[in-house]
Interface confidence: low
């Protein structure tokens, strides 16, 4: 799903307040709901009819440092006999997510949000067949 | 996929630098790669063999303000005849993502990252049936 552009007003104080320095704001350390966790079924990436593999990317100047990307294993879907059925399609499910980018020049450290496109998994769909006359 | 806890060192400056004020850091406004966007197949939520609906939650003090959650429509999966087959399971694919929370007390505005669990879509899997004697 799509993350809309950040509104100019999002980083602003109420109108009656003195303006903030252009370009930066105060970021509290720590993460709200940091202990919240995924409760997905086990090994769905291999048990799915549209199975996928995971690739991990690592960047120490990003939080989270580890970003995991899924890649669909097949063009088609796996049928009850364990064979690929190319009358159906395995398609990626994507999600726009935010990460925090750490930027430092010497002793000056600042942070900025970065939008990252993550493929979370795959699903099996009926193909769109637009017949052209 | 799981976001690990933020390391204490992530918000710190290099050792040779003077310490930063405890509890807050500088957040640059603007979003890196803000124009990047999802390029998913059309209507996969209705074309999937494990179809889902979307629910939108809205919070003006969160960026993005709109967070979309998927809910699987069925317990089973949709077969070639368009009927539900409950020998298979539709299961949610979840992703831990970050949002930016705006907090204000009077004229003091600060921001904090918040972890949000998003169900991105659903996939069709073979059920786990380990029978333990």
């Amino acid at each position: 799903r799509k993350i809309p552009k950040v509104g100019h007003t999002f980083f602003q104080k109420p109108e009656s307040c003195p303006p903030v320095p252009e370009g930066s704001m105060k970021l509290d350390t720590g993460i709200i709901n940091e202990n919240q966790r995924v409760s997905m079924s086990r090994n769905i990436e291999s048990r799915s009819t549209s199975p996928w593999n995971y690739t991990v990317t690592w960047d120490p100047n990003r939080y989270p440092s580890e970003v995991v990307q899924a890649q669909c294993k097949h063009l088609g879907c796996i049928n009850a006999q364990g064979k690929e059925d190319i009358s159906m399609n395995s398609v990626p499910i994507q999600q726009e997510t935010l990460v925090l980018r750490r930027k430092h020049q010497g002793c000056s450290v600042s942070f900025q949000l970065e939008k990252v496109l993550v493929t979370v998994g795959c699903t099996c769909v009926t193909p769109v067949v637009h017949h052209v006359q | 996929r799981k976001i690990p806890k933020v390391g204490h060192t992530f918000f710190q400056k290099p050792e040779s630098c003077p310490p930063v004020p405890e509890g807050s850091m500088k957040l640059d406004t603007g979003i890196i790669n803000e124009n990047q966007r999802v390029s998913m197949s059309r209507n996969i939520e209705s074309r999937s063999t494990s179809p889902w609906n979307y629910t939108v939650t809205w919070d003006p003090n969160r960026y993005p303000s709109e967070v979309v959650q998927a809910q699987c429509k069925h317990l089973g999966c949709i077969n070639a005849q368009g009927k539900e087959d409950i020998s298979m399971n539709s299961v949610p694919i979840q992703q831990e993502t970050l949002v930016l929370r705006r907090k204000h007390q009077g004229c003091s505005v600060s921001f904090q990252l918040e972890k949000v669990l998003v169900t991105v879509g659903c996939t069709c899997v073979t059920p786990v049936v380990h029978h333990v004697q």
Partner: antibody, heavy 125, light 106 residues
């Protein structure tokens, strides 16, 4: 051997709270969904609540929604039922039970193959 | 929600006779999710059958389950004295148990 040992029942006044515990042994507790089932005197079985292996999926019967809270501590191999705002109609023998299969749809039951001995909850003034 | 109705409420039979217990669902239920239990006075329920027809560990073969869709049956081929008890069917969902059938000595 595989067993579930319950504790925490008793006599309580309407509106008060009680916490039931269920200690598991003899199987890999954190692989399985767990359930609470009750039986009012002279009546049939009523499913109360269920919780998945990792607490990610939780379900309640309409009759207890908003008043009862199921939880588990996998490190302690224990299941709990926190019962608040108790009513006379909550009077029953309460059983904890283990889900038969390691399954995805943990709020749905294939069957319950191991049961606790039961603990009596009496709500009366 | 799916409601399970068991019949008869009470079944009066003699040892050695065949018992046929019915469980009817208000809408179609996958046989994967249909189970039967036995409960004797003062005891916890005991799983007999799961997946509509599979016997649980240690259950004698005189107990058998069958059925699909909305109609399921538990059959006890020859009643033994220890089989006189209450029997419940169960399906997945938020109101999973039937009302029970009491099998009593005639």
């Amino acid at each position: 051997q595989v067993q579930l040992v319950q504790s925490g029942g008793g006599l309580v006044q309407p509106g008060r709270s009680l916490r039931l515990s269920c200690a598991a042994s003899g199987f890999t507790f954190d692989d399985y969904a767990m359930h609470w089932v009750r039986q009012a005197p002279g009546k049939g079985l009523e499913w109360v609540s269920g919780i998945s292996w990792n607490s990610g999926t939780i379900g309640y019967a309409d009759s207890v929604k908003g008043r009862f809270t199921i939880s588990r501590d996998n490190a302690k191999n224990s299941l709990y039922l926190q019962m608040n705002s108790l009513r006379a109609e909550d009077t029953a023998l309460y059983y904890c039970a283990k889900e038969l299969y390691i399954s995805d749809w943990d709020s749905y039951s294939y069957g319950m193959d191991v049961w606790g001995q039961g603990t009596t909850v009496t709500v009366s003034s | 929600e799916i409601v399970l109705t068991q019949s008869p409420g009470t079944l009066s039979l003699s040892p050695g006779e065949r018992a046929t217990l019915s469980c009817r669902a208000s809408q179609s239920v996958s046989s994967s999710y249909l189970a039967w239990y036995q409960q004797k006075p003062g005891q916890a329920p005991r799983l007999l059958i799961y997946g509509a027809s599979s016997r649980a560990t240690g259950i004698p073969d005189r107990f058998s389950g069958s059925g699909s869709g909305t109609d399921f049956t538990l059959t006890i081929s020859r009643l033994e004295p220890e089989d006189f008890a209450v029997y419940y069917c169960q399906q997945y969902g938020s109101s999973p148990f039937g009302g029970g059938t009491k099998v009593e000595i005639k």
